[in-house]
């Protein structure tokens, strides 16, 4: 039974050329987190934190994505194309998969950054029908 909940930074805005921190936090479960994946709105993978090996920033983003703080992610040198949804996916044992959503709006103007921290409903899936199975590459 999946008892956990994910809190995220929710809907946030940041200035073009600036940086922003994406944060997710899993609570209310004793499940062991084996890895956390960060994914962009177009399903491109940004980063992963493996419990044993640590952080890996996917190479296409290595110059403008930084790990942390914590299990969060820092996006740098923001462009208008960075506007959109971001997802954190917690892979846990024995619970399975928890997923959180953040919406980032990148602003042209110098509007101050703001963030609303709130809880969102969890999306829980068992490993055996995890969507990541479909990410395998075949040759």
């Amino acid at each position: 039974m999946m008892t956990g909940t994910i809190e995220t930074t929710g809907n946030i805005s940041a200035k073009k050329g600036g940086s922003v921190i994406l944060q997710c936090h899993l609570s209310s479960t004793m499940a062991q987190v084996t890895q956390v994946n960060w994914e962009q709105h177009d399903h491109s993978l940004l980063a992963i934190r493996n419990a044993e090996l640590g952080w890996h920033i996917y190479p296409a983003f290595k110059d403008r994505v930084a790990p942390g703080p914590g299990l969060g992610l820092t996006l740098q040198s923001l462009t208008m194309n960075d506007t959109g949804e971001y997802f954190c996916t917690y892979h846990t044992y024995p619970d399975g998969t928890y997923r959180g959503r953040i919406f980032l709006e990148v602003l042209e103007s110098s509007v101050a950054e703001h963030s609303a921290r709130f809880q969102i409903p969890i999306e829980g899936r068992d490993y055996k029908d995890d969507d990541d199975k479909h990410h395998h590459h075949h040759h």
């Epitope: 084996t34 890895q35 994946n37 993978l45 992963i48 934190r49 493996n50 090996l53 890996h56 996917y58 190479p59 296409a60 290595k62 110059d63 892979h91 995890d130 990541d132 199975k133 990410h135 395998h136 590459h137 075949h138 040759h139």
Partner: antibody, heavy 126, light 109 residues
Framework: QVQLQESGPGLVRPSGTLSLTCAVS?????????WSWVRQPPGKGLEWIGE???????NYNPSLKSRGTISVDKSKNQFSLKLTSITAADTAVYYC???????????????????WGQGTTVTVSS | SYELTQPPSVSVSPGQTARITCSGD??????AYWYQQKSGQAPVLVIH???KRPSGIPERFSGSSSGTMATLTISGAQVEDEADYYC???????????FGGGTKLTVLG
């Protein structure tokens, strides 16, 4: 301590098939790693041959032109390389290696080949 | 096909800093890895993902990457660092993975 040990014939006839095996100890062949083959012709550099994930997914060096096949035998905790239509250019020291990954579900997020066998010499000659 | 270019040889005196370069058109969007191979031995991973050092690798080994060039730096090279060094690159989707031609590092004892 993870160890890899290559085995196979030291001499192969031209146009024949080369079959090599890599025995894995200290780790499970079913764990989330890419199991890789690399070779080194005498006096030359390293050449990546290909790899297999525990799921059965494979990647190969395009230069092999479909001559190579990598497979896993979970019951024996080993993986193998078969190379067909062998020529003298395939003479080399063949290494097997373990490549770790960050994404244990999909095999993405390459950490690097952190454990290697000691290598086995294969000579192609009639 | 994708290629990585390294200088054939680099020489330094003990205690000096050795720099070995690796160039490749796709390196801005790929990671560089560095393997050390001493004579008659299997390769050893000394740097992964441009700049990360595996446990057990001395701190004098470091890596960096800028644009199409990756660099392995050995600060205060020692005689035991004499070896062939190979850069290696891959993207996260896996294919192709490729080695550079290798650089022979001589530490003039």
């Amino acid at each position: 301590q993870v160890q890899l040990q290559e085995s196979g014939p030291g001499l192969v006839r031209p146009s024949g098939t080369l079959s090599l095996t890599c025995a894995v100890s200290g780790d499970s062949i079913s764990s989330s790693n890419w199991w890789s083959w690399v070779r080194q012709p005498p006096g030359k550099g390293l050449e990546w041959i290909g790899e297999i994930y525990h799921s059965g997914n494979t990647n190969y060096n395009p230069s092999l032109k479909s001559r190579g096949t990598i497979s896993v035998d979970k019951s024996k905790n080993q993986f193998s390389l078969k190379l067909t239509s062998i020529t003298a250019a395939d003479t080399a020291v063949y290494y097997c290696a373990r490549a770790r990954v960050y994404d244990i579900l999909t095999g993405r997020g390459y950490y690097g080949m952190d454990v290697w066998g000691q290598g086995t010499t294969v000579t192609v000659s009639s | 096909s994708y290629e990585l270019t390294q200088p054939p040889s680099v020489s330094v005196s003990p205690g000096q800093t050795a720099r070995i370069t690796c160039s490749g058109d796709a390196l801005p969007k790929k990671y560089a890895y560095w393997y050390q191979q001493k004579s008659g031995q299997a390769p050893v991973l000394v740097i992964h993902e441009d700049r990360k050092r595996p446990s057990g690798i001395p701190e004098r080994f470091s890596g960096s990457s800028s644009g199409t060039m990756a660099t392995l730096t050995i600060s205060g090279a020692q005689v035991e660092d004499e070896a062939d060094y190979y850069c290696f690159s891959t993207d996260s989707s896996g294919n192709p993975r490729v080695f550079g031609g290798g650089t022979k590092l001589t530490v003039l004892g």
